[in-house]
Amino acid sequence: SGTTNTVAAYNLTWKSTNFKTILEWEPKPVNQVYTVQISTKSGDWKSKCFYTTDTECDLTDEIVKDVKQTYLARVFSYPAGNVESTGSAGEPLYENSPEFTPYLETNLGQPTIQSFEQVGTKVNVTVEDERTLVRRNNTFLSLRDVFGKDLIYTLYYWKSSSSGKKTAKTNTNEFLIDVDKGENYCFSVQAVIPSRTVNRKSTDSPVECMGQEKGEFREI
């Protein structure tokens, strides 16, 4: 129940990539505004995005405090210009979000191949260690800092002249693979958290090929 001129938010959805986390909902407001609250299961409610006409709220600053916690958010609806108004039950209309555990659920962002270097028949491929918005001791942590060995990378590599993709895996950010001498190869990487049951894989990195400026070739 609520006042006759407000409607409850619905379709509350968490959108999160590399811990950048936004709560989205519907409907677009007509003569109403929204305020969001977030809490952990055992914590107090904290208000964010006060009296907004947006249908999203950036909750990154709250969830990065402890990415392994489970969070719940709720969206309150108020009549525009009369935010003190409450529903018949004595409180504004609100809707709860699904629970959200950032460590288990944030999408893995598209990785980037930082460099590759060929030495003879070996190629060393390095994946950029992307910075997240998770802080420790006033510094931003990388994806590897946050996930540790839970995070692996899968490398796809193939001869420029063929289509079949070989794979290699690493729990660091570096691969050392064997290649055929005199052949040009292309590379793409995918971030994976195997211990998850959903959101296990990132999208593929942009493809990088030998003979382009990102790599380095050394004949030994």
Epitope: K166, K169, N171, V192, T197, V198, N199, R200, K201
Partner: antibody
Framework: EVQLVESGGGLVQPGGSLRLSCAAS????????IHWVRQAPGKGLEWVGY????????YYADSVKGRFTISADTSKNTAYLQMNSLRAEDTAVYYC?????????????WGQGTLVTVSS | DIQMTQSPSSLSASVGDRVTITCRAS??????VAWYQQKPGKAPKLLIY???FLYSGVPSRFSGSRSGTDFTLTISSLQPEDFATYYC?????????FGQGTKVEIK
């Protein structure tokens, strides 16, 4: 419960074609990789190929390259093995298996298999 | 491609026996080796992963070890349900490859 169910096997003449299906339940195939492995009667296991259903990328054993094609329909949570130009030596039980995708665990769940017989 | 050479191809043993099966990789595969058990008419089942880790639900009489490129599957005390064929497999590089199999039969 994780399950893989193959279907589509049967008797086919040399030079013919067959499409096998691998229907997955209990997990989303785009979060994993799917492999096909075959076993000729009385013989050992032979890896055929894999697909990453998320991007459609594949790799095949030399023995089937150019004749077999692995594909996936993520909306149906199903992988396929299209077999063309079949030969007598392709006669086998064909299994699909899920690749867990870690450094440590590879093929953790297998289907029950479907028999393909190539004979005139 | 990496070859996995498995031995013996078959062995006869009695219930309660200690059984050892070995696999040699043709080049370094780190610990990316799995062992599977297969019974007639059934799909293979994962027993050991990463050379020495027991997969969930597998009895503790099964164990795996690694020494360089040599990998061993040991059944400490053979049970009636263990009579089957066992395969090693490397997944260090593409294509993954299997050993030829070891059939464990009743003596």
């Amino acid at each position: 419960e994780v399950q893989l169910v193959e279907s589509g096997g049967g008797l086919v003449q040399p030079g013919g074609s067959l499409r096998l299906s691998c229907a997955a339940s209990g997990f989303t195939i785009s979060d994993y990789w799917i492999h096909w492995v075959r076993q000729a009667p009385g013989k050992g296991l032979e890896w055929v190929g894999y697909i990453d259903p998320q991007n459609g990328w594949t790799y095949y054993a030399d023995s089937v390259k150019g004749r077999f094609t692995i594909s996936a329909d993520t909306s149906k949570n199903t992988a396929y093995l299209q077999m063309n130009s079949l030969r007598a030596e392709d006669t086998a039980v064909y299994y699909c298996a899920r690749d867990y995708g870690s450094l440590t665990i590879n093929l953790d769940y297998w289907g029950q298999g479907t028999l393909v017989t190539v004979s005139s | 491609d990496i070859q996995m050479t498995q031995s013996p191809s078959s062995l006869s043993a009695s219930v309660g026996d200690r059984v050892t099966i070995t696999c040699r990789a043709s080049q370094d595969v780190n610990t990316a080796v799995a062992w599977y058990q297969q019974k007639p008419g059934k799909a293979p089942k994962l027993l050991i992963y990463s050379a020495s880790f027991l997969y969930s639900g597998v009895p503790s009489r099964f164990s795996g070890s690694r020494s360089g490129t040599d990998f061993t599957l040991t059944i400490s005390s053979l049970q009636p349900e263990d009579f089957a064929t066992y395969y090693c497999q490397q997944h260090y590089t593409t294509p993954p490859t299997f050993g030829q199999g070891t059939k464990v039969e009743i003596k």
